[in-house]
């Protein structure tokens, strides 16, 4: 059994009835001029004149792929028989968004499956979806070019008060986790020292409860709790924090001796060990990496080293005895 009617006959292409042998005779000077490739495409076997019956193959530039039938056929009348072919992007271009929005991660091109997060300055939230995924040559969901930032409900409520508080006449009072937190607010990963457990909590609820003097609640990181280095460090940081002499409020968080509050992001960022000031009487005797020698470090150095995920064993609080 053969799927070809004329077994063994030379065919031009699978979807054509005409065979090479049935093509009309070619005059010496007849043929087709070079065809125009689709946008972002080029002709692989490029030349000035093509013989009748000759095919040209359309290829696409890097970052694009052919969609449709990529061969053009030179016809006896000097024209090209061409199906619908186009070069479609296989990557997404960094979207053009309003200047107020920040794109993370910030790249020129994104591969299929990669996602971006849009964020707003402090006190504002994205007025629409904040997460987008590259699918084929476009973003899903589509990114509206009118997408902007709007005042965060938390910020609206709080007026001139601190986070977790609301304006009541001329004074600031704590928000009620039940009454004032029915609106959507971003998820935070939070640690409860009483129950010795971590859980995901809406930001509004966490801040309201913290304001109501629930000192056992500690911010771990923005986003829902997920196993990994961020959670691991958040828990270790909470343990170290009890000995910190510095406790500086910073957005949802509190910064400690080994951290600085970033003015632009309102997040606590670990210092690097050389940035630690020597002062302070919170000392620890430690062993670094695989070293056998003991070293006295201050709490800032201990915090920065652990934050950087460098191997260090805390032997005991206070100076090394040796």
């Amino acid at each position: 059994f053969s799927i070809m009617e004329n077994n063994g006959q030379p065919c031009i292409n699978d979807d054509e009835e005409m065979k090479e042998v049935d093509l009309p005779e070619i005059e010496a000077d007849s043929g087709c001029p070079q065809p125009v490739p689709p946008e972002n495409g080029f002709i692989r076997n490029e030349k000035q004149l093509y013989l009748v019956g000759e095919d040209v193959e359309i290829s696409c530039l890097t970052g694009f792929e052919t969609v449709g039938y990529q061969y053009f056929r030179c016809l006896p009348d000097g024209t090209w028989r061409q199906g619908d072919v186009e070069c479609q992007r296989t990557e997404c271009i960094k979207p053009v968004v309003q200047e107020v929005l920040t794109i993370t991660p910030f790249q020129r091109l994104y591969r299929i499956g990669e996602s971006i997060e849009l964020t707003c300055p402090k006190g504002f939230v994205v007025a629409g979806p904040s997460r987008y995924t590259c699918q084929g040559n476009s973003w899903t969901p589509p990114i509206s070019n009118s997408l902007t930032c709007e005042k965060d409900t938390l910020t609206k409520l709080k007026g001139h008060c601190q986070l977790g508080q609301k304006q009541s006449g001329s004074e600031c009072i704590c928000m009620s986790p039940e009454e004032d937190c029915s609106h959507h607010s971003e998820d935070l990963c939070v640690f409860d020292t009483d129950s010795n457990d971590y859980f995901t909590s809406p930001a509004c609820k966490f801040l309201a409860e913290k304001c109501l003097n629930n000192q056992q609640l500690h911010f771990l990181h923005i986003g829902s709790c997920q196993d990994g280095r961020q959670l691991e460090w958040g828990l270790e940081r909470t343990r170290l924090s009890s000995n910190s002499t510095k406790k500086e409020s910073c957005g949802y968080d509190t910064c400690y001796d080994w951290e600085k509050c970033s003015a632009s992001t309102s997040k606590c960022v670990c210092l690097l060990p050389p940035q630690c000031f020597k002062g302070g009487n919170q000392l620890y005797c430690v062993k670094m990496g695989s070293s056998t020698s003991e070293k006295t470090l201050n709490i800032c150095e201990v915090g920065t080293i652990r934050c950087a995920n460098r191997k260090m064993e805390i032997l005991h609080p206070g100076k090394c005895l040796a």
Epitope: P105, H221, G228, R229, Q230, W233, K260, S262, S264, T265, K267, V269, C270, L271, L272, P273, P274, Q275, C276, F277, K278, G279, K295, C307, A308, N309
Partner: antibody, heavy 118, light 112 residues
Amino acid sequence: EVQLVESGGGLVQPGGSLRLSCAASGFSFSDYYMAWVRQGPGKGLEWVATINYDGSSTYYRESVKGRFTISRDNAKNTLYLQMNSLRSEDTATYYCARPSTEALFAYWGHGTLVTVSS
Amino acid sequence: DVVLTQTPLTLSVTPGQSVSISCRSSQSLLNDVGNTYLYWYLQKPGQSPQLLIYLVSDLGSGVPDRFSGSGSGTDFTLKISGVEAEDVGVYYCMQASHAPYTFGAGTKLEIK
């Protein structure tokens, strides 16, 4: 006001030695890590070495390990860089730098030029 | 070592014009706890470098707010909104997310 003044630079032959000094004032010298950063003629910047408060921990870039030694004398408020087995690629202006909570190299001296040439 | 590639190498601008300098890293500068140690320095002619921006987007002490930093991962930008004559010099980006600390080759800003 934080002030860092480098000295000790000069012309030296390949294989030779030189000792740079950085006199610090305007802050409590022994409370800070200190560093050396260099800049080749018409070139970019390159971190060289860092030392902790009391000199018990030192860190070097790979290309100078075993040849350069960073040290300090807290009583004299002075940072040093002993450079041995000098090579032509060590030709640069050497800056002394102090960190702050903002950055590793927040305060810089005016630099001292080291030329390694035969 | 992490390579920081700055573009353009030279910028020739007129006072009041806004400019951007790009700094691209050979690997992500975002560490596993979410911190990015990227800095911008300006070295004015005949002077030592001075800190402009730290931690990607925080303004250094005493730095005019016409300077701003942005970016994440491997792509970072320094923007000067309305260049002034005193802004001439070489701009360097520097990373401290990975040892050893490394600097970009610099971008020279000159006034037309």
